[in-house]
């Protein structure tokens, strides 16, 4: 019986220009983790392979850093980074386990306040 579960940071928010750590944790299984894929929608952000190490997709290499652990750090956030992120654990012998994180990137409180009361 495959009983593994993925715990994630769930729904999180961060300020524009800041950074955020995306974390997933696989528990309740003795399966061996062979690879973790980090994806946004169906775009590959990064891969951590147990034997071969980390790879960050070229289009994200300036703003994505590996770790901590099997997690992923997103830097220089923009409002376009708002959306769903998935950690996909490839394990042996269970197969794949998928975790979902929703990130909302907010304007900074100063910018938000300024925009709200801006005179046209």
């Amino acid at each position: 019986m495959m009983t593994g579960t993925i715990e994630t940071t769930g729904n999180i928010s961060a300020e524009k220009g800041g950074s955020i750590i995306l974390q997933c944790h696989l528990s309740s299984t003795t399966a061996q983790v062979t690879q973790v894929n980090w994806e946004q929608q169906d775009q590959l952000l990064a891969i951590c392979n147990a034997d071969l190490g980390w790879h960050i997709s070229p289009s994200f290499k300036d703003r994505v850093a590996p770790g901590p652990g099997l997690g992923l750090t997103l830097q220089s956030l923009t409002v376009n980074d708002t959306g769903e992120y998935f950690c996909i654990y490839h394990t042996y012998p269970d197969g794949t386990y998928t975790g979902r994180i929703f990130l909302e990137v907010l304007e900074s409180s100063v910018a938000e306040h300024g925009a709200r009361f801006q005179i046209p």
Epitope: N37, G95, Y97
Partner: antibody, heavy 121, light 110 residues
Framework: EVQLVESGGGLVQPGGSLRLSCAAS????????VPWVRKAPGKGLEWVGY????????YYADEVKGRFTISADDSKNSLYLQMNSLKTEDTAVYYC??????????????WGQGTLVTVSS | RIVMTQTPLSLSVTPGQPASISCQAS??????LAWYLDKPGQPPQLLIS???KLASGVPDRFSGSGSGTDFTLKISRVEAEDVGVYYC????????????FGGGTKVEIK
């Protein structure tokens, strides 16, 4: 236009060798996984092997391991399948195909037309 | 390695009627499940990726669903051009990684 074109198929005797080529155009070949897949007469689709586009290892199906070798020439945007010690059960149409998301979508969106390999005495 | 089991082996459908094909994997594969249509004399065509994402140019009468180990391809109203062999496919990551195809389901028109 994004396309893949295979060549090099033909008739070969059991125990013989053949080298297939796959020429890619319209996309950056080195940034995609391009596996070889075959379809034997009256049989289903069968994965043959591919080069991992990110980490570099080459993987093969058990049925061809030790007999087939895949290589690539990024400067020519081409992939090759060297087939040695051919068996009659290797008779098939051989396709190269593109894995659409940097080689890690694990789904093949572009296929060549295929090249027929016949192993017979 | 993963074993992909498709059912049924063949299907005869009246035009305009729905059709459904199942694919079961020997281990969890979500979300990496794709469906293809293979017609004689043509290369296979990607229909669905990531279990439910319709490929570019594919009619919306095709849909995919499922998660974990069990997946389904549905055709809401079968047309004559839909005849051929349908394959599910996944991928496994281990010491020997690779693509895995189901055995195929032949769809014919009554």
């Amino acid at each position: 236009e994004v396309q893949l074109v295979e060549s090099g198929g033909g008739l070969v005797q059991p125990g013989g060798s053949l080298r297939l080529s796959c020429a890619a155009s319209g996309f950056d070949f080195s940034s995609y996984g391009v596996p070889w897949v075959r379809k034997a007469p009256g049989k289903g689709l069968e994965w043959v092997g591919y080069i991992d586009p990110i980490f570099g290892p080459t993987y093969y199906a058990d049925e061809v391991k030790g007999r087939f070798t895949i290589s690539a020439d990024d400067s020519k945007n081409s992939l090759y399948l060297q087939m040695n010690s051919l068996k009659t059960e290797d008779t098939a149409v051989y396709y190269c195909a593109r894995d659409y998301s940097y080689g890690y979508a694990y789904a093949l969106d572009i296929w060549g037309q295929g090249t027929l390999v016949t192993v017979s005495s | 390695r993963i074993v992909m089991t498709q059912t049924p082996l063949s299907l005869s459908v009246t035009p305009g009627q729905p059709a459904s094909i199942s694919c079961q994997a020997s281990q969890r594969i979500s979300p990496y499940l794709a469906w293809y249509l293979d017609k004689p004399g043509q290369p296979p065509q990607l229909l669905i990726s990531r279990a439910s994402k319709l490929a570019s140019g594919v009619p919306d009468r095709f849909s995919g669903s499922g998660s974990g180990t069990d997946f389904t391809l549905k055709i809401s109203r079968v047309e004559a051009e839909d005849v051929g062999v349908y394959y599910c496919q996944s991928y496994y990551v281990h010491t020997s990684s690779g693509y895995a195809f189901g055995g195929g389901t032949k769809v014919e028109i009554k």
